[in-house]
Amino acid sequence: EVEKTACPSGKKAREIDESLIFYKKWELEACVDAALLATQMDRVNAIPFTYEQLDVLKHKLDELYPQGYPESVIQHLGYLFLKMSPEDIRKWNVTSLETLKALLEVNKGHEMSPQVATLIDRFVKGRGQLDKDTLDTLTAFYPGYLCSLSPEELSSVPPSSIWAVRPQDLDTCDPRQLDVLYPKARLAFQNMNGSEYFVKIQSFLGGAPTEDLKALSQQNVSMDLATFMKLRTDAVLPLTVAEVQKLLGPHVEGLKAEERHRPVRDWILRQRQDDLDTLGLGLQGGIPNGYLVLDLSMQEALS
C-alpha cells in the first residue's frame, strides 16, 4: 500500500507523459488522477515506467475499478498486463479479439503464464466456442495451445477452425485429444483431393480409426514412419501386411528400425510370419506358419 500524501505544488499530472517516469512512488500516487490514467492508458505503454511505478499505476486502476477493468482500459494495458493476477483477470469481460491480441503480444516469447491462461479462458467462455479467428490467434502465439485443452473443451472447436491448425500445433497432443480432433479435421478437409487431403490430415491421424487407415492405404500416400508411429495401436493392429506396405510405400523399410516399439511391435505380433517375410526386412516375432489365429474378441461378440 502506498501512503496517502498531498501532491507537491506544481506536480499535479495534467496528462500521462514522460515526465512521470521521474516521479517517486508516493508522487505518482498523489499526483496522478486515476480517471486521467484510465482515459490515457494508451500512453502508458509508450512510457518506460519502472516496475515499482507500474505497481502504483495498477493500484490506482484497482481502486477506480474494484469490480474489474472495462475493456477500453484492458485493451491498452500493454506491459501493465504482466502485473495482473489471475484473480484480477477473472473480473474482466474481454470480447474483442483485438484486445486479446494486444495482451498476448505483451507476453510474446514467454511461457503461457497463469494470467494468460485465465485471459484465454475468459475470452473463449465469453465467445461460447473456439472459432477460427480465435484459434488462429492463439496458436500463432502459443503453438501448443490446442493440446493444453481437455477433450471436452476441444469438442467445442468447430470443424471450420481446423483450417487454422498447423502440424506443430499438435506436437504435444495425446491420443485422447486427437480422437476428438480427427473427425473434425476429416470433415473440414473432406472436399480436398487425395494428395492434398493427406497433407492436411496427416497431423491428425493419431486419432484415425482402422477403416480410415485402410482407405488411405489404397491412395498411394507414402506415410512417413514418424506419422505411422503416432497412430493408435488399436487402429494399426487389424491392418494387414499388404495394407501397411501400401500405406508406407517406400518408407516401409523404416519398420525394421522400429520393430521393438509400439505400435510396430504389437502389429508384428499379430501378423503371420510368412506375410512379414514378404517385406524382406527381416522382421521377426510374427505368428509361426501353421498356427491358427482365433480372434477372441470376435467370438465374444458373436456369442
Partner: antibody, heavy 121, light 109 residues
C-alpha cells in the same frame, strides 16, 4: 551531429571534490534526460545518476548517494556531476550519456568520450 | 535487485564465425527494458540493440538480439575484424534504476 564533450577529470586526493562537465550540441538538450555512467579500470560499466530533462528530478546509485550531485544548465546545454567526499573506489572513467526514451525502450543512444577521475593520496 | 549475468566471460572466435552471447537476469524482466552495447578499448560504449531485439540506427544486420523473461541472447553472424570488443547487456526499470552485466569479451582466436 550529436556531440557530448566531457571535461573536468583529473587526479584528486581522497575526501576532496571534483566537478565534471558534459557540453552537448547537435540536439535539443532540454528535451532529453541525461545520465552519468562510470567504469573502473579494467572493470564493467556502472550506472551513477540520472537527471530529468528539466532538472527537477534526480536519481542516484546507492554507492554515490549523498556524495554526488547531478545537475544541468539548459541555457548552456551542459550537464554536471559534482563529486564530493571522493574515495579510492570512485576511481574510474566517467561517461555522460543521452537517454533515448521516446520509443518507450530506454537506451543510451549517445555517449561522451569519457573523462578519467583518479582518487589517490 | 535484478542482477544480469553474462556468459561466457570470454569468447574466442575467428572472423567469419558466429558469436552467441548470453545474458541471464536473476528474475523475469520486460523485453523492452533490455539492451546491448559494444565497447572497444579506449572508446565509449555504443548502443547496438534496444527492446531486446531492435537494432539501433546504423547497426549492421549481422547483429541480432532475442530472448524474453530471464534469458537473452546477442548473436553476431559472420564476425568482422571490427566486431572484436567487449559486449554488455543492460536493464532498466528496477532498483538500481539501471544495471549492466559484467560483460563478455569477444577476442580473435
Amino acid at each position: 551531429q550529436v556531440q557530448l564533450v566531457q571535461s573536468g577529470g583529473g587526479v584528486v586526493q581522497p575526501g576532496r571534490s571534483l566537478r565534471l562537465s558534459c557540453a552537448a550540441s547537435g540536439f535539443t538538450f532540454s528535451s532529453y534526460a541525461m545520465h552519468w555512467v562510470r567504469q573502473a579500470p579494467g572493470k564493467g560499466l556502472e550506472w551513477v545518476a540520472v537527471i530529468s530533462y528539466d532538472g527537477s528530478n534526480k536519481y542516484y546509485a546507492d554507492s554515490v548517494k549523498g556524495r554526488f550531485t547531478i545537475s544541468r544548465d539548459n541555457s548552456k546545454n551542459t550537464l554536471y556531476l559534482q563529486m564530493n567526499s571522493l574515495r579510492a573506489e570512485d576511481t574510474a572513467v566517467y561517461y555522460c550519456a543521452r537517454w533515448k526514451v521516446s520509443s518507450s525502450s530506454p537506451a543510451f543512444d549517445y555517449w561522451g568520450q569519457g573523462t578519467l577521475v583518479t582518487v589517490s593520496s | 535487485e535484478i542482477v544480469l549475468t553474462q556468459s561466457p566471460a570470454t569468447l574466442s572466435l575467428s572472423p567469419g564465425e558466429r558469436a552467441i552471447l548470453s545474458c541471464r537476469a536473476s528474475q523475469s524482466v520486460y523485453t523492452k527494458y533490455l539492451g546491448w552495447y559494444q565497447q572497444k578499448p579506449g572508446q565509449a560504449p555504443r548502443l547496438l540493440i534496444y527492446d531486446a531485439s531492435t537494432r539501433a540506427t546504423g547497426i549492421p544486420d549481422r547483429f541480432s538480439g532475442s530472448g524474453s523473461g530471464t534469458d537473452f541472447t546477442l548473436t553476431i553472424n559472420r564476425l568482422e575484424p571490427e566486431d572484436f570488443a567487449v559486449y554488455y547487456c543492460q536493464h532498466y526499470g528496477g532498483s538500481p534504476l539501471i544495471t549492466f552485466g559484467q560483460g563478455t569479451r569477444l577476442e580473435i582466436k
